[in-house]
């Protein structure tokens, strides 16, 4: 039986402007020329999506235009990047990936990395 | 060899509930993904609701609130309670499992949802 399998890092930290990026490189089993991959995050045992892209291999990664997410890629690595993160959105935030054509359909899943987010200090007020 | 079998599926009414298991023999501790993907009539397949290897329990956005995924590990079985089944819904709903993905797959149910 084929495996896929989906690397992704434990742990990144989030920029002070709220911008996390890490990469999900997938090993994939056959070859596919069109590839989803989707973001999603772990908050008490429930899974639910952030953002997701459909891409034909070779071609950019496109995300919804309200999306929260970027990414570009490059074979088998995506690189992601998530925004306007604060620090209530701290978590696990898994990569899944989907190979989505020719068939035989393949899905993955990235044991997750944990984002930690640290809002800011507000700047002091300053007499000068 | 991991071998996966469903059951439950069938015709049911708009409105109706049904529930599907998946037994699972053959099961090996590295096997930390099981879920629920289907394939609608001309349609692709779709990740449906599903056991991750982080411990968190996944469903896609259409069958939140009606659907409910379940595992008894005593049995070997995974469970998919449907609620609530629209026309939308008919579709072969195949059990699928994995160290970290859709590595074994069973041979599928057909789930009919028709007045």
């Known amino acids: 039986c084929k495996a896929m399998h989906v690397a992704q890092p434990a742990v990144v930290l989030a920029s002070s402007r709220g911008i996390a990026s890490f990469v999900c490189e997938y090993a994939s089993p056959g070859k596919a020329t069109e590839v989803r991959v989707t973001v999603l995050r772990q908050a008490d045992s429930q899974v639910t999506e952030v953002c997701a892209a459909t891409y034909m291999m070779g071609n950019e990664l496109t995300f919804l235009d309200d999306s929260i997410c970027t990414g570009t890629s490059s074979g088998n690595q995506v690189n992601l990047t998530i925004q306007g993160l604060r620090a209530m959105d701290t978590g696990l935030y898994i990569c899944k990936v989907e190979l989505m054509y020719p068939p035989p359909y393949y899905l993955g899943i990235g044991n997750g990395t944990q984002i930690y987010v640290i809002d800011p200090e507000p700047c002091p007020d300053s007499d000068f | 060899e991991v071998q996966l079998v469903e059951s439950g599926g069938g015709l049911v009414q708009p409105g109706g509930s049904l529930r599907l298991s998946c037994a699972a023999s053959g099961f090996s501790p590295s096997v930390n993904y099981m879920g629920w993907v289907r394939q609608a009539p001309g349609k692709g397949l779709e990740e449906v609701s599903s056991?991750?290897?982080?411990?968190?329990?996944f469903y896609t956005d259409s069958v939140k609130g009606r659907f409910t995924i379940s595992r008894d590990n005593s049995k070997n079985t995974l469970y998919l309670q449907m609620n609530s089944l629209r026309a939308e819904d008919t579709a072969v709903y195949y059990c699928?499992?994995?160290?970290?993905?859709?590595?074994?797959w069973g041979q599928g149910t057909l789930v009919t949802v028709s007045s």
């Open positions: 699928a499992a994995g160290k970290y993905g859709t590595d074994y």
């Open positions: 056991i991750y290897p982080t411990g968190g329990t």
